[in-house]
């Protein structure tokens, strides 16, 4: 007995060949002996079996002795062993339809975990393995799942089910819904303004959600709520601001903020969460804020940082053109009775200046100019 | 077991629509094709078509252009509309079940039966 | 759509008689036929199916034959209870359609 492999929602077709290649009398009828399908002479006709509707031929092979039931809009109820009868002989088919879905969405955060879920009809014993957009092999019988999603993971599933030696290919689209980058930071001097961007990692047709910035200061013993805001139909509208600092925010996607000057007080971490409309959990994305400050009094030259930096980060005081006179991985560096000219002070890693600040120091007898 | 039970107006106008609900007791709607059979004085048995829940209705083609046959399965309930009636729809209508298993296809539970009556 | 024609239209017959009602199509349904029994004011009930297949709980008086075309359903010795209307259908195509019917009447 011959056996074909069909997916949910596709179409089949089953071949039935004569001897003769002429247009001759045949039957398809299911395992019931009901008729799904024949023909009286030249027309085609068709028994009440649950096929009626989708069940089909193709007359213009008739001539040529090729007798196909073709089958639209396949159920896994479908399944079922399908006998042609042409020639006082009978043919059998087997068709074993097969359903691959995903759990509840195929739009998940990250993090999350995917469920797949094989329909299959009684009586079978399918064995499936999935290949992820990057490449990572899974196997499973009934249902497979990953959990902790990545961004990686987003893309198109191929899945193949294996049964009697045959094999149907699925392919499943996943859209993991998460920020761009997991963190960023901004490195500023004083007084600058800062830009946020909080591009998002997929497109969807509505976006709909609502989401905060909580921001930790460095200086400040807890965290606080600096902006609330909505977003519907990818329109962003802000609920609620604090008054220090007045944060301002752009009105269409990707997410923008803007803090009208960078300040050592506003030096430190937040954190910008993203609930979206019928999904459970929040995109997560992690922003820091490192602020440079330098500054002359009377006869000491400081170089100072606030914010999260890493303990490799080299801050450094030089003299343009010369070499650095006192290079730390510190936060704060100081040059005693500083020579007149421009010095630059400079927060490199592995010699890559991430941020930078000049300052004028005149002779000793007039005032320092920051340029 | 399964009962089936028809319900509608035993009077319509010519020209009005018949409109006729049939209720499945005893099992679900949604696992057979579900049929309506007329019966007059001078058609004898004529089905009128039928309807399972995944699939579209087939109708007879003698009726197809004014008949509708529609299934809610939260009330385990299916329907017949019948519109643009004249005296020759003047018919007793069973609703039916139609079951397939080995070698036979065909109605195997009837409702009681309900006259329906064209005149003005 | 597949025609059926019964005959006879009406018949009389006695208790312990034989009764032979015929059916034919008009095209071959193979064995795709099954045979009603109508008692008035109530629904059909199927008797005989595939042609010559004896329903569950159907006594074994009633028989049916022939394939094709041509069909013939018999009570070989007809009890009081069998007085009814007799019905042919055929499934070998949509629409499902009937005889006109056969009414055994008591002589």
């Known amino acids: 007995k011959k056996v074909v492999l069909g997916k949910k929602g596709d179409t089949v077709e089953l071949t039935c060949t004569a001897s003769q290649k002429k247009s001759i009398q045949f039957h398809w009828k299911n395992s019931n002996q009901i008729k799904i399908l024949g023909n009286q002479g030249s027309f085609l006709t068709k028994g009440p079996s649950k096929l009626n509707d989708r069940a089909d031929s193709r007359r213009s092979l008739w001539d040529q002795g090729n007798f196909p039931l073709i089958i639209k809009n396949l159920k896994i109820e479908d399944s079922d062993t399908y006998i042609c009868e042409v020639e006082d002989q009978k043919e059998e088919v087997q068709l074993l339809v097969f359903g691959l879905t995903a759990n509840s969405d195929t739009h998940l955060l990250q993090g999350q975990s995917l469920t797949l879920t094989l329909e299959s009809p009684p009586g079978s014993s399918p064995s499936v393995q999935c290949r992820s957009p990057r490449g990572k092999n899974i196997q499973g019988g009934k249902t497979l799942s990953v959990s902790q999603l990545e961004l990686q993971d987003s893309g198109t599933w191929t899945c193949t089910v294996l049964q009697n030696q045959k094999k149907v290919e699925f392919k499943i689209d996943i859209v993991v819904l998460a920020f761009q980058k997991a963190s960023s930071i901004v490195y500023k001097k004083e007084g600058e303004q800062v830009e946020f961007s909080f591009p998002l990692a997929f497109t969807v047709e509505k976006l709909t959600g609502s989401g905060e910035l909580w921001w930790q200061a460095e200086r400040a013993s807890s965290s606080k709520s600096w902006i609330t805001f909505d977003l519907k139909n990818k329109e962003v509208s802000v609920k609620r601001v604090t008054q220090d600092p007045k944060l301002q925010m752009g009105k269409k996607l990707p997410l923008h903020l803007t803090l009208p000057q960078a300040l050592p007080q506003y030096a430190g971490s937040g954190n910008l969460t993203l609930a979206l409309e019928a999904k459970t959990g929040k995109l997560h994305q992690e922003v820091n804020l490192v602020v440079m400050r330098a500054t002359q009094l009377q006869k000491n030259l400081t170089c100072e940082v606030w914010g999260p930096t890493s303990p490799k980060l080299m801050l450094s005081l030089k003299l343009e053109n010369k070499e650095a006179k006192v290079s730390k991985r510190e936060k704060a560096v100081w040059v005693l009775n500083p020579e007149a000219g421009m010095w630059q002070c400079l927060l490199s890693d592995s010699g890559q200046v991430l941020l930078e600040s000049n300052i004028k120091v005149l002779p000793t007898w007039s005032t320092p100019v920051q340029p | 077991q399964v009962q089936l039970q028809e319900s509608g107006p035993g009077l319509v106008k010519p020209s009005e629509t018949l409109s006729l609900t049939c209720t499945v007791s005893g099992g679900s709607i949604s696992t057979y094709y579900w049929s309506w059979i007329r019966q007059s004085a001078g058609k004898g048995l004529e089905w009128i078509g039928r309807?399972?829940?995944?699939?579209?209705?087939n109708y007879n083609p003698s009726l197809k252009s004014r008949v509708t046959m529609s299934v809610d399965t939260s009330k385990n309930q299916f329907s017949l509309k019948l519109n643009s009636v004249s005296a020759a729809d003047t018919a007793v209508y069973y609703c039916?079940?139609?079951?397939?298993?080995?070698?036979?296809?065909?109605?195997?539970?009837w409702g009681q039966g309900t006259t329906v009556t064209v005149s003005s | 759509d597949v025609q059926m024609t019964q005959s006879p239209s009406s018949l009389s017959a006695s208790v312990g008689g034989r009764v032979t009602i015929t059916c034919q199509a008009s095209?071959?349904?193979?064995?795709?036929l099954n045979w009603y029994q109508q008692k008035p004011g109530k629904a059909p009930k199927l008797l005989i199916y595939?042609?010559?297949n004896l329903e569950t709980g159907v006594p074994s008086r009633f028989s049916g034959s022939g394939s094709g075309t041509d069909f013939t359903f018999t009570i070989s010795s007809l009890q009081p209870e069998d007085f009814a209307t007799y019905y042919c259908q055929q499934y070998d195509n949509l629409p499902l359609t009937f005889g006109g019917g056969t009414k055994v009447e008591i002589k």
């Open positions: 039916a079940r139609e079951l397939e298993r080995p070698y036979y296809y065909g109605m195997d539970v």
């Open positions: 095209q071959d349904i193979s064995n795709y």
């Open positions: 595939y042609a010559s």
């Open positions: 309807i399972y829940t995944s699939e579209r209705p």
